[in-house]
Amino acid sequence: QKSSIEKCSVDIQQSRNKTTERPGLLNCPIYWQQLREKCLLFSHTVNPWNNSLADCSTKESSLLLIRDKDELIHTQNLIRDKAILFWIGLNFSLSEKNWKWINGSFLNSNDLEIRGDAKENSCISISQTSVYSEYCSTEIRWICQKELTPVRNKVYPDS
Amino acid sequence: QKSSIEKCSVDIQQSRNKTTERPGLLNCPIYWQQLREKCLLFSHTVNPWNNSLADCSTKESSLLLIRDKDELIHTQNLIRDKAILFWIGLNFSLSEKNWKWINGSFLNSNDLEIRGDAKENSCISISQTSVYSEYCSTEIRWICQKELTPVRNKVYPDS
């Protein structure tokens, strides 16, 4: 006699064979906060940007990617303390002389009003009220994200 | 009338409330290869180590973490060409003067026989036959991993 969960595994596997999607997150893991179609994890410890990226990766997640001003504001509303900074998945690409998201796309200049310099070894942090350029070696908190709802036929080509 | 998949969503959500696990991958996404309890994605493009880490992260996966010699050999068996190098999730920590996995753990010296220097800006690549220390700026392929089976009560504290 199969449990309902085991039966589900079969159902979802059969569904995947038709849709080539991964099951995805149906709701957020414990300790993660839902914000629309994402799950966010606000770290309690501090790290330089690179270690923050690594931490999110080992959690099978990404440093926060912000689509637009609206998402920025909604994320900032979850930050309780005005003075705390959190790394997101945006840093300065020296070769391309531009702000680059870790998914390879460039920052749309209208999306975020960045305070500070656009230069080598600069990474982006957000606070409750602002977006800052900081040295990537600065040890602050960070935000990881997971996509909550699976996208049909989502595949993973190289960046 | 709910579809079997929608019913499953409810069942799995109810199950999660009891076990605090995330649904996890039931099988590997398209283009990913199963190796035991992991899904692996071998890139077809090249990148420095840092960009490879970012790429895996945006795919909600991790640069490959290798538990032991046995897993290394099984992974190497999937590499077709003797000369091609792939980044894994291991680099040299200057502050700790040791090889460090991106999940924060240190390399067990018996696990991998590394050819090359343990020094600043060194990252680890694997080939079909060996494990090499290379400059992290070297542009080679990389391997991302996703855990295939969920672990009961798996939570995500900070590293």
Partner: antibody
């Protein structure tokens, strides 16, 4: 057709400058380490310089360091070698060469151009 | 810098002969070695990489072996189109990427 075509060679006086170009076609240029290799008349092969796929890492042979500059334009599928302060001993056929993909800085040259002759003489 | 010494510097052979060329490195280069063939007025052609891997499109009569400091290129049965100069090259990840002095294979 997968190929590399060099241009820009010629006769130049000692102390002069020359810019070599290499046009790549038939492959994804931006994914490969590219090099310049030269061969003096009747002599063996000498590696001159390499550039990484993104252009972020560059290396030179000691014999040309400070005088030659390698660069690339991935949008134009082109590789360049700017040669300044040329000497008689720089006289050679200059080849543009592609390295096997994903072998990093272990440069196995799997595709070569036909070469362009640079003659440095007064 | 790593020096590569090829021997012999020239060899006279006939069609059908087995020809062996050696390359000795001044220090351990693991398997980071390539072999090239060059004909007069032409660019070199990659034959063998990673000491023993045959490059795509290269006839199977060519083979490479060795690791560390001693390497061999073997042509099992010499063909008319094989008369050329052969170079070894070390490709450890640190420049310069030195070539051997070359071995000329001539018709006996």
């Amino acid at each position: 057709q997968v190929q590399l075509v060099e241009s820009g060679g010629g006769l130049v006086k000692p102390g002069g400058s020359l810019r070599l170009s290499c046009a790549a076609s038939g492959f994804t240029f931006a994914q490969y380490y590219m090099s310049w290799i030269r061969q003096a008349p009747g002599k063996g092969l000498e590696w001159v310089s390499y550039i990484s796929p993104s252009g972020s890492t560059i290396a030179y042979a000691d014999s040309v360091k400070g005088r030659f500059t390698i660069s690339r334009d991935n949008a134009k599928n082109s590789l360049y070698l700017q040669m300044n302060s040329l000497r008689a001993e720089d006289t050679a056929v200059y080849y543009c060469a592609r390295s096997l993909m994903a072998t990093g800085t272990h440069l196995y040259f799997d595709l070569w151009g036909r070469g362009t002759l640079v003659t440095v003489s007064s | 810098d790593i020096q590569l010494t090829q021997s012999p510097s020239s060899v006279s052979a006939s069609v059908g002969d087995r020809v062996t060329i050696t390359c000795r490195a001044s220090q351990d280069i693991s398997s980071w070695l390539a072999w090239y063939q060059q004909k007069p007025g032409k660019a070199p052609k990659l034959l063998i990489y990673a000491a023993s891997s045959l490059q795509s499109g290269v006839p199977s009569r060519f083979s490479g072996s060795g690791s560390g400091t001693d390497f061999t290129l073997t042509i099992s049965s010499l063909q008319p189109e094989d008369f050329a100069t052969y170079y070894c090259q070390q490709v450890t990840s640190f420049p310069p990427y030195t070539f051997g002095g070359g071995t000329k294979v001539e018709i006996k």
